[in-house]
């Protein structure tokens, strides 16, 4: 018996089709991925294949101007629309709290909602009960196929979940579900989940019963032979994972942004055993035309969009200095003001002894675009700051050895004086630059704000200690030449987009004033 | 849990038919195809075709093409191998199995003598 | 269509040892690889399916490996109970192909 699994993960609010780097769509020729596109695909494999499931695996929520505007009301519809039959949870659904995932999103879709490793408790046992399932059977064609969630347990430090929900170890948590599957005679089950490349890997292993995984979070790319596009694939399609009880289990998951729609064929024997499995990403470049339905659907929808964009989110009393002459050679009230927002986005106070899990946040003077004049009335909008911030970046979360932070901080004085972007505007830290001495040796003080402490103080900063720091994705992917941050980071969970992180700050803080403040020196 | 039940043995002459039949429980029958292979005594394994319960839909191996005829009858999930023009080479246990051939049916003797 | 050779036709094991049974395609069958033990007696079971999975019930003593057009199957410590006629099986092509068996008897 043959399934056609199609999967998404980590669209992030890419409702629209993108360019190839997954940025706003500028020549339309060229762009790719959204979701007239992806619902022409999907339409087209399901008039040619039997026995079709369409499956998300988490992190629809977040990443352009469409969620920040519509807080998920654009998932639920569009996912309906593409007549979705599953998806997981993923960290960033959280990311508006539990009401902000059960009213637009978990209410009004049409597809179940997974997640087999989030226990509700105290009041929102009853309120959320039967929003989401740990499990959901569905038939197809003559058979039925057991889909079992998962999300990332790191869930309570990379969005707002609140405290009457556990997020519980996911294979403890998978294999009691999957048992009671097993029991009901339903012998074909995917694990569809959220928490990464490597714990989907070890769901493979050691989850017994689960026979294919659908991940996300990772935004890992697959691909069996000469990749179609940039990405570099980090291993085959399916990835085979060898389980403990000696089945080969395929493992998949497909980049991000919308880009591609993952397509796993899968050959089930009766007893439920994968007898093989291949496909592909397929690239939703442009010889897939978008559907006209869809593509007018969203052309309603994107209305509201343009209207909120020159709406006022606050006001600055102070001229907002985004200029390449201050913030790519010394401290800049911008850069100060980003930084305070981004730190701001990822208060999660989990623990009595932690004031908060993440103090700081550096970020590359280059990616500052645009200054915001005082004198329009002090008003900001989400166009001012798409000028200031472009490329559609995210603000993420590592955690790097103080050796590595070190590194980082050479490398942002290597050649100062000649306006290079790779100058790092900080939160949380105050470094100290000798410019006299030699490249690779100008840091000669740098301190960093505690966290396990209830009374925030700057301590030298310790070269073994592992640190948590708030940066652009670009810096995470090595940008500007920070390869030591991408070679040596310990972990690295994407975070909010750039613009919303900020935005939301100005309006949380009505009227900003941000000083230089002698943050770097 | 997957089982295939044959029918009982039987006895035939040079140029008879024989009919055997495979009934099938445990599983989504119309999902699935089924296998039939031959051992003659003191032999290997010899796949004769394989027939989608679905559509009816077969494939034979060359060497039994045009003697050999697979059935299915879905309102009994029960598949059938009938084999004509029987030879004394004919006699053999004859199995049905799975689609991958992960169950497989009790076998069935077809002695074929004068 | 696809030769199987198997190898060897026969051999004899103590409990305990190390046995190692192989494959060989007539051309590439890319892992669509079954083997089976049919004990004394008829009584057909699949062991492995797809080159290396185990089925399930069967004991992680017996493994499968290989790729292309040669394959293997192992038995880590024999047992009383593995002596037994060991097959494989192609299915990557019509007509599928069973190779020679292996009958695996006690020293």
């Known amino acids: 018996w043959e399934l056609t699994i199609l999967h998404t993960n980590d669209v992030h609010s890419r409702l629209e089709q993108t360019s190839e780097d997954s940025s706003k769509c500028v020549n339309a020729s060229r762009c790719m991925g959204g979701v007239a596109r992806l619902f022409t695909k999907v339409q087209q494999i399901r008039r040619a294949e039997p026995n079709v499931l369409l499956l998300d695996a988490g992190d629809q929520y977040q990443g352009t101007i469409w969620f920040t505007v519509y807080k998920g009301a654009e998932v639920a519809h569009f996912m309906n629309a593409l007549r979705y039959d599953a998806m997981a949870l993923g960290n960033h659904e959280f990311d508006n709290g539990v009401e902000g995932l059960i009213e637009p999103l978990l209410k009004e879709a049409k597809f179940p909602i997974l997640s087999a490793n989030i226990k509700a408790k105290g009041p929102l046992a009853s309120q959320i009960s039967g929003l989401y399932l740990p499990y959901k059977v569905l038939p197809v064609g003559d058979e039925v196929v057991g889909i079992v969630g998962y999300t990332s347990k790191e869930t309570p430090f990379l969005s707002n979940p609140g405290t009457n929900l556990v997020f519980e170890d996911e294979i403890t948590a998978l294999q009691p579900e999957v048992d009671k599957l097993k029991t009901l005679n339903v012998n074909k089950i995917i694990a569809l989940g959220h928490s990464g490349f490597e714990m989907d890997k070890l769901i493979a292993q050691k989850v017994r019963g689960v026979d294919v995984v659908v991940g996300g979070h990772s935004n890992t790319f697959l691909y069996t032979g000469n990749p179609p596009s940039k990405e570099v694939p980090a291993g085959k399609y399916p990835f085979i994972v060898t389980s403990d009880d000696g089945r080969k289990v395929p493992v998949v998951q497909a980049y991000a942004f919308g880009k591609y729609l993952g397509y796993l064929k899968i050959e089930f024997d009766e007893r439920g055993n994968v007898i093989s499995s291949h496909g592909n990403p397929i690239l939703l470049n442009s010889s897939i035309p978008e559907d006209p339905s869809i593509k007018a659907d969203i052309n309603k929808w994107r209305i509201k969009l343009d209207n909120y964009s020159t709406q006022e989110l606050g006001k600055t009393i102070v001229y907002l200095d985004g200029s390449s002459q201050s913030c790519r050679f010394r401290e800049c009230n911008m850069g100060n003001l980003i930084c305070d927002a981004m730190i701001n986005n990822n208060l999660r106070h989990t623990d009595e002894m932690f004031w908060n899990h993440v103090s700081m946040c550096i970020l590359n003077g280059g990616g500052i675009r645009s200054p915001i004049d005082e004198r329009n009335n002090g008003t900001i909008t989400w166009e001012n700051l798409a000028a200031v911030l472009p490329f559609g970046g995210t603000f993420d979360l590592v955690q790097l050895k103080g050796s590595t932070l070190k590194k980082a901080f050479e490398h942002s004085v290597h050649r100062y004086g000649q306006s290079t972007g790779e100058f790092l505007q900080v939160g949380g830290i105050h470094v100290v630059y000798d410019l006299s001495r030699k490249p690779g040796d100008r840091v000669v003080k740098l301190d960093v704000l505690c966290t396990k402490c209830r009374v925030p103080s700057y301590d030298p900063l310790k070269m073994d200690e592992v640190y948590k720091v708030i940066l652009p994705n670009f810096l995470a992917n090595g940008g500007d030449g920070f390869q030591m941050i991408k070679d040596e980071l310990l972990r690295h969970d994407s975070g909010d987009q750039d613009i919303n992180v900020v935005s939301t700050y100005i309006s949380k803080m009505k009227v900003i004033y941000p000083a230089v403040e002698g943050r770097i020196k | 849990e997957v089982q295939l039940v044959q029918s009982g043995a039987e006895v035939k002459k040079p140029g008879a038919s024989v009919k055997v039949s495979c009934k099938a429980s445990?599983?989504?029958?119309?999902?699935?195809?089924m296998n039939w292979v031959m051992q003659a005594p003191g032999q290997s394994l010899e796949w004769i075709g394989r027939?989608?319960?679905?559509?009816?839909?077969?494939f034979y191996s060359q060497k039994f093409k045009g003697r050999a005829t697979l059935t299915v009858d879905k309102s009994t999930s029960t598949v059938y191998m009938e084999l004509r023009s029987l030879r004394s080479e004919d006699t053999a246990v004859y199995y049905c199995a799975t689609s991958y051939v992960g169950d497989w049916g009790q076998g069935t003797t077809v002695t074929v003598s004068s | 269509d696809i030769q199987m050779t198997q190898s060897p036709s026969s051999l004899s094991a103590s409990v305990g040892d190390r046995v190692t049974i192989t494959c060989r395609a007539s051309?590439?069958?890319?892992?669509?690889l079954n083997w089976l033990q049919q004990k004394p007696g008829g009584a057909l079971k699949r062991l492995i399916y797809?080159?290396?999975s185990l089925d399930s019930g069967v004991p992680s003593r017996f493994s499968g490996s290989g790729s292309g057009s040669d394959y293997t199957l192992t038995i880590s410590s024999l047992q009383p109970e593995d002596f037994a006629t060991y097959y494989c099986?192609?299915?990557?092509?019509?007509?599928?192909?069973f190779g020679g068996g292996t009958k695996v008897e006690i020293k």
């Open positions: 445990g599983y989504t029958f119309t999902a699935y195809f």
């Open positions: 051309q590439d069958i890319g892992d669509s």
């Open positions: 099986l192609q299915y990557a092509s019509f007509p599928w192909t």
């Open positions: 797809a080159t290396s």
């Open positions: 027939i989608y319960h679905n559509n009816g839909d077969t």
